[in-house]
């Protein structure tokens, strides 16, 4: 869908991972003066939400409140702007935003090999494991918008595990992991306990995550 205006932006506050029963605000905004904003969840016929746009300092926006969070509210959302109503003349869609519900199943365990404190340049692998038969594990890093995803390996010693190779350590960070099942990709477990990875021999304590560009060429390393 091309749209008569360029696409608005869609953001989740405080973030796109939403604990069960909590509320998330999806903010649709644009520098085009839209009088109306529509929020649509992929695959849904009925649940398109409409809000009148607010205008301030050359920006139009609408804040859609989604919650209390339940399984049937998770999914892929897009927002649209429209200058008119009845009929709407929709803009191009925003980039899709996946809203995930967390806190549904038991938390996995997160550990680091060779350990959570490493020397600069040393290779680090984070392992997420659980006795629950999760198909997928998702690793998130505090301050990062995206997670990386790995399939769980076969059951070993009663647990299902996925390993996330972070490569040579340069910076530290706080990590968490979640488990999910293949047929419910927007429904995740409770978060693992946070794991603080520290790097010795480097003045900074932030770490380029696996989803950030791995070199100055700007090509992201997506671990999906």
């Amino acid at each position: 869908h091309e749209g008569v205006h360029r696409k608005p932006s869609l953001l989740a506050h405080p973030g796109r991972l939403v604990k069960s029963e909590e509320t998330v605000i999806l903010q649709c905004w644009s520098d085009v003066r839209f009088e109306h904003f529509l929020l649509h969840r992929e695959g849904k016929f009925k649940d398109t939400l409409h809000l009148i746009g607010e205008h301030h300092d050359g920006v139009s926006k609408a804040n859609f409140s989604i919650g209390p969070m339940m399984q049937d509210l998770a999914g892929t959302y897009r927002c649209y702007g429209s200058v008119t109503h009845s009929p709407y003349q929709l803009s191009a869609p925003s980039d899709p935003l996946d809203i995930v519900i967390t806190g549904l199943y038991e938390k996995p365990s997160l550990s680091a090999q060779p350990g959570p404190t490493v020397l600069a340049g040393e290779s680090v692998t984070l392992s997420c494991s659980s006795r629950s038969s999760y198909d997928m594990y998702h690793l998130s890093r505090e301050g990062e918008a995206h997670e990386c995803r790995f399939s769980a390996g076969p059951k070993v010693n009663g647990t299902f595990q996925a390993d996330f190779p972070l490569g040579p350590a340069t910076h530290g960070g706080t990590y968490r992991c979640f488990g999910s099942f293949r047929d419910s990709p927007y429904e995740w477990s409770n978060s693992s306990d946070p794991l603080l990875v520290s790097v010795i021999g480097n003045p900074s304590n932030s770490w380029p995550s696996p989803t950030e560009p791995s070199s100055k060429t700007g090509n992201p390393r997506h671990l999906h």
């Epitope: 049937d72 009845s86 929709l90």
Partner: antibody, heavy 120, light 111 residues
Framework: EVQLVQSGAEVKKPGSSVKVSCKAS????????ISWVRQAPGQGLEWMGG????????NYAQKFQGRVTITADESTSTAYMELSSLRSEDTAVYYC?????????????WGRGTLVTVSS | QSVLTQPPSASGTPGQRVTISCSGS????????VNWYRQLPGTAPKLLIY???QRPSGVPDRFSGSKSGTSASLAISGLQSEDEADYYC???????????FGGGTKVTVLA
């Protein structure tokens, strides 16, 4: 003025398929939701499913899942409902109805209906 | 068997008030708004009340809707001969993931 013009009456054999069209005028076709509702002789209304062309979203009533296909052609402002594996109890008047994007199930305009008769 | 339950018939004399009930459950009327449609013999249905109690333009204020819990009702005051029609309630059903209708109520205006 908004108009939903439906295709003409059909007589079909059991086991065959029927495809009914609904051409919209007087509005931006893709920016609305189109539903299909049927009414068997002397009976009540029954929602079969609907489509929002601009979102490419089709929803079907559980009863008709796998047997009905609803599509839309934005270039001709026409929605279609195809029902397969017809049986005698599918004899009914089939209506298309329009809703706004955000009130997709509030049917503010209706077509005049298409009578589909299933008979051997 | 319809998901929403309506009485099959209702009647009144001209000028009287007639009320039609529509009973559902927590997954439809209990958690979604109700629309009412009126169907004259041999014609397509027409939207009469939306969002429980709102009238589209052109619908006289003799028609009013209300909702309480898992039930809704349509009231017609000052009944007129042209009100003879079938009336249907409708709502989204979260469990069935679709629109459900009542079985319809035939309103007769007695001479």
């Amino acid at each position: 003025e908004v108009q939903l013009v439906q295709s003409g009456a059909e007589v079909k054999k059991p086991g065959s398929s029927v495809k009914v069209s609904c051409k919209a005028s007087g509005g931006t076709f893709s920016s609305y939701a189109i539903s299909w509702v049927r009414q068997a002789p002397g009976q009540g209304l029954e929602w079969m499913g609907g489509i929002i062309p601009i979102f490419g979203t089709a929803n079907y009533a559980q009863k008709f899942q796998g047997r009905v296909t609803i599509t839309a052609d934005e270039s001709t402002s026409t929605a279609y409902m195809e029902l397969s594996s017809l049986r005698s109890e599918d004899t009914a008047v089939y209506y298309c109805a329009r809703g706004e994007l955000d009130t997709a199930i509030r049917f503010d305009y209706w077509g005049r209906g298409t009578l589909v008769t299933v008979s051997s | 068997q319809s998901v929403l339950t309506q009485p099959p018939s209702a009647s009144g004399t001209p000028g009287q008030r007639v009320t039609i009930s529509c009973s559902g459950s927590s997954s439809n009327i209990g958690s979604n708004t109700v629309n009412w449609y009126r169907q004259l013999p041999g014609t397509a249905p027409k939207l009469l009340i939306y969002s429980n109690n709102q009238r589209p333009s052109g619908v006289p204020d003799r028609f009013s809707g209300s909702k309480s819990g898992t039930s809704a009702s349509l009231a017609i005051s000052g009944l007129q001969s042209e009100d003879e029609a079938d009336y249907y309630c409708a709502a989204w059903d979260d469990s069935l993931n679709g629109v459900v209708f009542g079985g319809g109520t035939k309103v007769t205006v007695l001479a």
